[in-house]
C-alpha cells in the first residue's frame, strides 16, 4: 500500500546554474494524498533557514505530483545560495534537501557602471 505521508522530492545536492536578469522558477515537487499541505520556501544562512516572506510563489498541479514554485522575476546576484522547501502536514514539519542556485552576473565589470554613473545617466 502506498504511503500517504507528504513527500518532498528535491534530490540531494541538486543545483541550478542560472543567469541574473532572467526569470527562473525553483520547483519543490510535493506528493500528497488528500489535503494539500502548507508549503514554504526558505534560504539557508549558515545553519539557519530564513523564511522567504515577500516572494512570489504558486502551485502547479500535475497528475501524480504537484509543484510548489518559487518565482524569481528576475534572478538577482543576491539570489545565489541554497534553498529548502518545507511542508506542514498534520502538525508535522517535513523538510526537503537543499537545492543550490549558482547565479552568474551576466554584466561584466566593464559594462556595469557604478551607482554614481548609473544615477548620472538619467540626467544626460
Amino acid at each position: 500500500k502506498e504511503s500517504c505521508d507528504v513527500q518532498l522530492y528535491i534530490k540531494r545536492q541538486s543545483r541550478h546554474s542560472i543567469l541574473a536578469g532572467d526569470p527562473f522558477e525553483l520547483e519543490c515537487p510535493v506528493k500528497y494524498c488528500a489535503n494539500r499541505p502548507h508549503v514554504t520556501w526558505c534560504k539557508l544562512n549558515g545553519t539557519t533557514c530564513v523564511k522567504l516572506e515577500d516572494r512570489q510563489t504558486s502551485w502547479k498541479e500535475e497528475k501524480n505530483i504537484s509543484f510548489f514554485i518559487l518565482h524569481f522575476e528576475p534572478v538577482l546576484p543576491n539570489d545565489n545560495g541554497s534553498y529548502r522547501c518545507s511542508a506542514n502536514f498534520q502538525s508535522n514539519l517535513i523538510e526537503s534537501h537543499s537545492t543550490t542556485l549558482y547565479v552568474t552576473d551576466v554584466k561584466s565589470a566593464s559594462e556595469r557602471p557604478s551607482k554614481d554613473e548609473m544615477a548620472s545617466r538619467f540626467w544626460a
Epitope: G21, D54, R55, Q56, E73, P74, P77, N78, K107, R121
Partner: antibody
Framework: QVQLKESGPGLVAPSQSLSITCTVS????????VHWVRQSPGKGLEWLGV???????SYNPAPMSRLSISKDNSKSQVFLKMNSLQTDDTAMYYC??????????????WGQGTSVTVSS | QIVLSQSPAILSASPGEKVTMTCRAS?????MHWYQQKPGSSPKPWIY???NLASGVPARFSGSGSGTSYSLTISRMEAEDAATYYC?????????FGGGTKLEIK
Amino acid sequence: QVQLKESGPGLVAPSQSLSITCTVSGFSLTTYGVHWVRQSPGKGLEWLGVMWPGGRTSYNPAPMSRLSISKDNSKSQVFLKMNSLQTDDTAMYYCVRGDYEYDYYAMDYWGQGTSVTVSS
Amino acid sequence: QIVLSQSPAILSASPGEKVTMTCRASSSVSYMHWYQQKPGSSPKPWIYATSNLASGVPARFSGSGSGTSYSLTISRMEAEDAATYYCHQWSSNPYTFGGGTKLEIK
C-alpha cells in the same frame, strides 16, 4: 548613451489591433529586459509586460490574453501587439529598460512614450 | 494583485516646508521604488529600493518604510520639487504603481 524610442500608429479603431515598436540604443537586448507600461487618465500607470534578455516574456494577467511581446535582438527592437482595442486602451505607451542591482530590480530608462487613441 | 494606495492624492507645500507622502501596500512587499513625473514628460526614477536616491536626486529627498508602509520625505520643499510622485512595487506580478501624489508649491 541609453535611449528607447517608441513608434506607434497614433489612432486605432475600436476592435482593431495595436502594434508598437520600441527601438533601443546604448545597450543590448540580450543583457537587459524591456518593459511596456501605459499611462491613461483613468487607470494611471499600468505595467503590461516584459521581454526578458533570454527571450522569455511575463505579462500582467489582466490584459494578458490580448497582449503579445516579441523582439529582434539584431535590430535592437521590441514589439508590443495588443488585440481587440477598446476606448479605455487610450493611453500613452512607454517602453522602459529594466536593470538589476545586487539585491533589487527596477525600471531605469523610459522612452518618451507614444500616444495611442482608440476612436472610430 | 498588490494594490498601492498613495496619500494624500494632492499635497500643497510652501518653500522650505517639510513634506511627507505615503504609500500603503495591500500585501507586504520587499521594497518600494518611487518615480517623479512632470507634465509632458516620462516618469523618472527617483528613489530605488525604498531608500536609495537615483543619481542627480537632491539629498533633501529620502525614502523609508518596510512591509506594507512606505514614505517619501522632502526635508525642505523647493519649487522644482513640484511634480507627481508614484510608488511602484516589484515583488509580485502584476507589478503595480500607486495612483500618485501630486505635489504643488504654495
